[in-house]
Interface confidence: low
């Protein structure tokens, strides 16, 4: 807001009356002010605003007050020479009061030539018959942005869903640099991607790292002078491998005797990614097994022929027991019983053309 006082009574501790009576400019200020008709103190419609000198480009300071019979700048407690002011005046049609506006140009050289602890400043002073009013101080600073970041982000390798903090302290600058972050070459907008958060002190937080967050991250600092990029920090989001479930046990690999059964698993649940650790432990398990060997059946020797029976046949037999088939072995091929005709023994043979039956002893 504006600060008001009458006849040089200052609200600012800025050595107001440093300009002495032999200052050629100060002589042009009115010694006294008519008290009739009564007039309000000047009111600033526009006050000078802080400004930055970029490279060698001078800046303009501007102010506007009403009612004002005179309006001038003082910079660093010294009055600015009248010839350095550009002044315009008009009458406000509504109030009938005089509106005066003034501008001055400040060069880089002027700012650099100021010695002392305080920054270069200027303020507007306006007069009316009621007294003087001073504007706020407007500071004029030489803008710059140093090249070196005070802290640059560092690459990190993080597991899936881990929180990531990338730190950045921008280079010193006037005005203070604004910071934005790039993911690869795209500006990160935390409003668009809620997984990103930029802290008040410019650090980037990835709340829960996703595979898609594997990227190059760059801190960008910019002000009115320049734009600077930090070194790039590579964030690699890795996935540690996890085992699949075991397969079923295989059949015993030996058809006969000692062998083994096995089962397997793979490091695919998930598979390691981006440098994630491979699964620890065995991918194959084996256990011993024994399969009973198959025994093929073999015949015993034939028995003796039986006596010749009444049917005039006799027979002999053998067994599939030498050995008997076991554990899936093959059965014996061929006949168990063998018979053939005979005419001896108890054989009853009909006599030709007779109903008698001849019995032949053996």
């Amino acid at each position: 807001g504006s600060h008001h006082h009458h006849h040089h009574g200052s609200d600012y501790k800025d050595d107001d009356d440093k300009g002495s009576q032999d200052d050629e400019f100060f002589h042009e200020l009115p010694e006294t002010f008519p008290s009739d008709p009564p007039e309000p103190l000047p009111h600033f419609l526009i006050e000078p605003e802080e400004a930055y000198i970029v490279k060698n480009k001078p800046v303009n300071l501007y102010c506007k007050a009403s009612p004002a019979t005179q309006i001038y700048f003082k910079c660093n407690s010294e009055w600015v020479h009248q010839k350095d002011h550009v002044v315009d005046e008009r009458v406000d049609e509504t109030s009938g009061l005089i509106v005066r506006e003034v501008s001055i140009e400040i060069s880089r050289q002027q700012v650099e030539e100021l010695f002392g602890p305080e920054d270069y400043w200027c303020q507007c002073v306006a007069w009316s018959s009621a007294g003087t009013t001073k504007s706020r101080k407007a500071y004029v600073r030489i803008a710059y942005l140093r090249k070196t970041f005070e802290q640059e982000p560092l690459g990190k390798e993080v597991s899936l869903e881990q929180e990531v903090l990338l730190q950045c302290r921008p280079p010193e600058g006037i005005p203070v640099a604004e910071v934005e972050w790039l993911k690869n070459e795209d500006i990160i907008d935390p409003a668009e991607d809620r997984n990103f958060y930029i802290t008040i002190d410019h650090n980037l937080i990835i709340k829960q790292a996703r595979l898609s967050d594997t990227a190059n991250y760059t801190c960008v600092a910019k002000n009115i002078v320049a734009k600077r990029k930090s070194t790039t920090a590579t964030v690699i989001v890795y996935v540690n491998g996890g085992w699949s479930t075991w397969t079923e046990w295989s059949v015993c690999n030996s058809r006969c005797g000692r062998g083994y059964q096995k089962r397997t698993r793979t490091c695919t649940n998930p598979a390691p990614l981006n440098g994630g650790a491979f699964c620890e432990g065995q991918s194959v398990q084996k256990i011993a097994c024994t399969t009973l060997c198959p025994v093929d059946g073999r015949w015993t020797s034939w028995s003796k022929w039986s006596t010749c029976g009444t049917e005039c046949t006799h027979w002999r037999r053998r067994e599939c027991t030498a050995p008997a088939p076991k554990n899936g072995g093959k059965d014996c091929d061929g006949l168990v019983l063998q018979s053939k005709n005979c005419t001896d023994g108890l054989c009853m043979q009909a006599a030709p053309d007779s109903d008698d039956v001849a019995l032949y002893g053996s």
Epitope: K156, E157, N240, N274, G275, G276, A277, F278
Partner: antibody, heavy 119, light 107 residues
Framework: QVQLQESGPGLVKPSETLSLTCTVS????????WSWIRQPPGKGLEWIGY???????NYNPSLKSRVTISIDTSKNQFSLKLSSVTAADTAVYYC?????????????WGQGTLVTVSS | DIQMTQSPSSLSASVGDRVTITCRAS??????LNWYQQKPGKAPKLLIY???SLQSGVPSRFSGSGSGTDFTLTISSLQPEDFATYYC?????????FGGGTKVEIK
């Protein structure tokens, strides 16, 4: 069992480039972080930099301007080049595997090769 | 860079002793800390990763603890083969850095 083997000249002249290769056997060079670490005689360990099979590199800023680490996945090898060497670069140079965890432990190391910088 | 400071730089102990080595980081490194053992003329060997996880094949007399900035490697009962130099290493941020080492000698 993973094994690492450094190879390269044991003597390098000042201002020349030191070149070493690390051959990885018994395992794939994929999915890990492969580092070079050195140890001047009688002193401690200094990390030089790493490379991931994706081609991502990260170098120690103290050596960054002189270091290049590259990888050849087809040969299961990675290499170190250190330019403009001086006597201060005399050291045993180790290659090591960084297991892909946040703590990046070096779980396998080569046996080391002594490189002397002398004219 | 994160500085890793080990203490003591050397110690003398006897077989069967309980030995403790400490490692301090210049800033918090969470649990991003690994311990290695190195014998003369040999490459370092990983003992402990992630501050307290025992590497496969390492005897259970070795243990690690701590988080943030202060970490400890403990050998519960020193064996003849344990006389060596021990290094801590942070991997919270690059450049990865090692402690200066602690030499464990026979008393």
């Amino acid at each position: 069992q993973v094994q690492l083997q450094e190879s390269g000249p044991g003597l390098v002249k000042p201002s020349e480039t030191l070149s070493l290769t690390c051959t990885v056997s018994g395992g794939s060079i994929s999915s890990y972080f492969w580092s070079w670490i050195r140890q001047p005689p009688g002193k401690g360990l200094e990390w030089i930099g790493y490379i991931h099979n994706s081609g991502t590199t990260n170098y120690n800023p103290s050596l960054k301007s002189r270091v290049t680490i590259s990888i050849d996945t087809s040969k299961n090898q990675f290499s170190l080049k250190l330019s403009s060497v001086t006597a201060a670069d005399t050291a045993v140079y180790y290659c090591a595997r960084g297991r892909g965890m946040a703590t990046l432990p070096f779980d396998y190391w080569g046996q080391g090769t002594l490189v002397t910088v002398s004219s | 860079d994160i500085q890793m400071t080990q203490s003591p730089s050397s110690l003398s102990a006897s077989v069967g002793d309980r030995v403790t080595i400490t490692c301090r980081a210049s800033q918090s490194i969470s649990s991003y800390l690994n311990w290695y053992q190195q014998k003369p003329g040999k490459a370092p060997k990983l003992l402990i990763y992630a501050a307290s996880s025992l590497q496969s094949g390492v005897p259970s007399r070795f243990s690690g603890s701590g988080s943030g900035t202060d970490f400890t490697l403990t050998i519960s009962s020193l064996q003849p083969e344990d006389f060596a130099t021990y290094y801590c290493q942070q991997s919270y941020s690059t450049p990865l850095t090692f402690g200066g080492g602690t030499k464990v000698e026979i008393k």
